[in-house]
């Protein structure tokens, strides 16, 4: 039975040209996290494997940085980066947990960032 829950940064906004941290946190389960996939719509951005480390998809290498933690940093944002992002936690023995974040990239300099989720 899957008892875990994923907390995310939720809906966030950022300025064009800036950067943002996408953060998820899996709680309420003792399942072992074997891998976290970060996806944008149907595109794989990055993988963090518990044993081997990070893999950043080649097409995002210049604009995506690992971390902090299991999170992902998006840099040099463009309006095309607006959309849904998913953190997919592969765990054993529970299975897969998915969290959703919506990022809006704004042209103006008055982008109000949603409350950042901090992993303790």
């Amino acid at each position: 039975m899957m008892t875990g829950t994923i907390e995310t940064t939720g809906n966030i906004s950022a300025e064009k040209g800036g950067s943002i941290i996408l953060q998820c946190h899996l709680s309420s389960t003792t399942a072992q996290v074997t891998q976290v996939n970060w996806e944008q719509q149907d595109q794989l951005l990055a993988i963090c494997n518990a044993d081997l480390g990070w893999h950043i998809s080649p097409s995002f290498k210049d604009r995506v940085a690992p971390g902090p933690g299991l999170g992902l940093t998006l840099q040099s944002l463009t309006v095309n980066d607006t959309g849904e992002y998913f953190c997919i936690y592969h765990t054993y023995p529970d299975g897969t947990y998915t969290g959703r974040i919506f990022l809006e990239v704004l042209e103006s300099s008055v982008a109000e960032h949603g409350a950042r989720f901090q992993i303790p």
Epitope: Q32, Q35, D51, L52, H90, Y92, P93
Partner: antibody, heavy 117, light 107 residues
Framework: EVQLLESGGGLVQPGGSLRLSCAAS????????VSWVRQAPGKGLEWVGY????????YYADSVKGRFTISRDNSKNTLYLQMNSLRAEDTAVYYC??????????WGQGTLVTVSS | DIQMTQSPSSLSASVGDRVTITCRAS??????LNWYQQKPGKAPKLLIY???SLHTGVPSRFSGSGSGTDFTLTISSLQPEDFATYYC?????????FGQGTKVEIK
């Protein structure tokens, strides 16, 4: 006591195939990722590939991608490395190693693969 | 791929000496750095993981330090059984990569 025991090495001609096995004991095999690491004679260590404990997803070094396949049978506590289209540069001692927190914490004794005509 | 460079490639030391081996990564790897010892004809053994954590059963004369790109393995008082080749390995970016090794020989 954690133990890993490789087998299946030997002499094979270029272009040939070989399957290595790694029998695990002393720990819950299905809880751990496992990697293959090789060492050419007189050279350093090179990671070959990895398989996840439960879902079975795999990663490979570019040098073996498309030629080598890692699989596992958790019911038999055994890891496999299927090596096809072997080349002279694949000659090495092949080790299986348990992955833990980024390191390879336990290793087998190794099995020698020689690719030569 | 991340390149790992060890120095020196070999060194000669005496029993009781303090020995330091360094490992440099071509880009930051935070603290995802492991150290191994290998003796001729034997499999490598994990000594240190996550830059400074001692693996089970490893004597306390071995210690590791560093973060980012620069790391150090120190043997505080070299023992006869410590003559071997030492490898560093990063586990921050796939694929995992090893240094070329440092051979510690008897002076």
């Amino acid at each position: 006591e954690v133990q890993l025991l490789e087998s299946g090495g030997g002499l094979v001609q270029p272009g040939g195939s070989l399957r290595l096995s790694c029998a695990a004991s002393g720990f819950t095999f299905s809880n751990y990722g496992v990697s293959w690491v090789r060492q050419a004679p007189g050279k350093g260590l090179e990671w070959v590939g990895y398989i996840n404990p439960s879902r079975g997803y795999t990663y490979y070094a570019d040098s073996v991608k498309g030629r080598f396949t890692i699989s596992r049978d958790n019911s038999k506590n055994t890891l496999y490395l299927q090596m096809n289209s072997l080349r002279a540069e694949d000659t090495a001692v092949y080790y299986c190693a348990r992955s833990y927190g980024g390191g390879f914490d336990y290793w087998g004794q190794g099995t020698l693969v020689t690719v030569s005509s | 791929d991340i390149q790992m460079t060890q120095s020196p490639s070999s060194l000669s030391a005496s029993v009781g000496d303090r020995v330091t081996i360094t490992c440099r990564a071509s880009q930051t790897i935070e603290r995802r750095l492991n150290w191994y010892q290998q003796k001729p004809g034997k499999a490598p053994k994990l000594l240190i993981y996550d830059a400074s954590s001692l693996h089970t059963g490893v004597p306390s004369r071995f210690s590791g330090s560093g973060s980012g790109t620069d790391f150090t393995l120190t043997i505080s008082s070299l023992q006869p059984e410590d003559f071997a080749t030492y490898y560093c390995q990063q586990s921050y970016i796939i694929p995992p990569t090893f240094g070329q090794g440092t051979k510690v020989e008897i002076k």
